[in-house]
Interface confidence: low
């Protein structure tokens, strides 16, 4: 499986592009929208029929340090009577998203972009039933 | 994650904050995600709050295609498979982080931004407002 | 916040049209699907018509082949053209739509909400 390359090179390279070194690229971790302020509508995490909780994941070498993940509370989803239905299932609803990773070799530091997977909330779903012969 | 010791003889800078600007390798570190959501399950179809993907597609963003939800109702798919109005479909969104090309059109130069996408939809207890 | 304000209503004669519309206003970020509910003296409120973002749409039975939603996006309008009246279409017409918006420098992701709703009295 190819690692897959950001550079296009469809582009017509404007004379104004800063030049880089072969193999990679320069990065502005300036984030751009970076105080557009976000929160799920009025805790839609305990009022679905799939409830999930929040776990932050906190790496100093990755930039942002700070991931936030879901997960599912329950194995069925709740009914209207609050109780589990096992007949249904509460299943992850995930989403990419790309980092930085700082690594340390010696004395030297390098960085890499890397995806990483993220589980936003969570779904109830009919389940796919399998027939054993 | 846990920070790896340093040579105590290496200089200290950059040790707690990222750089404003750094070179990072062309080669992305990915886990093996699957990027077109259609083909990696059937949530979509199966959900009690079923949604449509809409594809977004950029030539000046990485990754250029982003796919959208949107919720196909207002409530719910209930057991007799009707929509129950007295449940709401609603979208779980997620800021992200992509890539902008910075300067536009430059094939190596990117600057990091932040969007906010509609990742799939749950069914919720709907907030009930009561008007006096 | 977000506001939904109707107008349109009034009375109609048996066989005659008239048209709704409802159009948001506030903060808003993006409408995915707007519509009409309607409410009869007496009864629950029950769906009209709903229209989603991508342009298609959902009727009741009861009024499939009379009425035609219809959104302008540009003025987070939903219009209602009611054709071929009938006295059991008499009810409090509600708009209805689910909306993202920004208050207070906080997003909020789509979440139902209401009109006050206008009066549609279908009599001769």
């Known amino acids: 499986r190819k690692i897959p390359k950001v550079g296009h090179t469809f582009f017509q390279k404007p004379e104004s592009c800063p030049p880089v070194p072969g193999g990679s690229m320069k990065l502005d971790i300036g984030i751009i929208n970076e105080n557009q302020r976000v929160s799920m509508s009025r805790n839609i995490e305990s009022r679905s029929t799939s409830p999930w909780n929040y776990t932050v994941t906190w790496d100093p070498n990755r930039y942002p340090s700070e991931v936030v993940q879901a997960q599912c509370r329950n194995l069925g989803c709740i009914n209207a009577q609050g109780k589990e239905d096992i007949s249904m299932n509460s299943v992850p609803i995930q989403q990419e998203t790309l980092v930085v990773r700082r690594k340390h070799q010696g004395c030297s530091v390098s960085f890499q972009l890397e995806k990483v997977l993220v589980t936003v909330g969570c779904t109830c779903v009919t389940p796919v039933i399998h027939h054993v012969q | 994650g846990i920070t790896i010791p340093r040579n105590p003889g290496c200089p200290n800078s950059e040790d707690k904050n990222f750089p404003r600007t750094v070179m990072v390798n062309l080669n992305i570190h990915n886990r093996n995600t699957n990027t077109n959501p259609k083909r990696s399950s059937d949530y979509y179809n199966r959900s009690t709050s079923p949604w449509n993907l809409h594809r977004n597609e950029d030539p000046e963003r990485y990754p250029s295609v982003i796919w959208e939800a949107k919720c196909r109702h207002l409530g719910c798919i209930n057991a007799d498979g009707n929509v129950d109005y007295h449940m709401n479909s609603v979208p779980i969104q997620q800021e992200i982080l992509v890539l902008r090309r910075e300067p536009p059109h430059c094939p190596n130069s990117f600057r990091l931004e932040k969007i906010l996408v509609s990742v799939g939809c749950t069914c919720v207890t709907p907030i009930v407002h009561h008007v006096a | 916040e977000v506001q939904l304000v109707e107008s349109g209503g009034g009375l109609v004669q048996p066989g005659g049209s008239q048209r709704l519309s409802c159009t948001a206003s506030?903060?808003?970020?993006?409408?995915?699907?707007m519509g009409w509910y309607r409410q009869a003296p007496g009864k629950q409120r029950e769906l009209v018509a709903l229209?989603?973002?991508?342009?298609?749409?959902d009727y009741a039975d009861s009024v499939k082949g009379r009425f035609t939603i219809s959104r302008d996006n540009s003025k987070n309008t939903v219009y209602l053209q009611m054709n071929s009246l009938r006295a059991e279409d008499t009810a409090v017409y509600y708009c209805?739509?689910?909306?993202?918006?920004?208050?207070?420098?906080?997003?909020?992701?789509?979440?139902?909400?209401w009109g006050q709703g206008t009066l549609v009295t279908v009599s001769s």
């Open positions: 209805a739509a689910e909306i993202g918006y920004y208050s207070g420098g906080t997003y909020y992701s789509s979440e139902a909400h």
């Open positions: 506030g903060t808003i970020v993006n409408i995915h699907v």
């Open positions: 229209i989603f973002s991508g342009g298609s749409a």
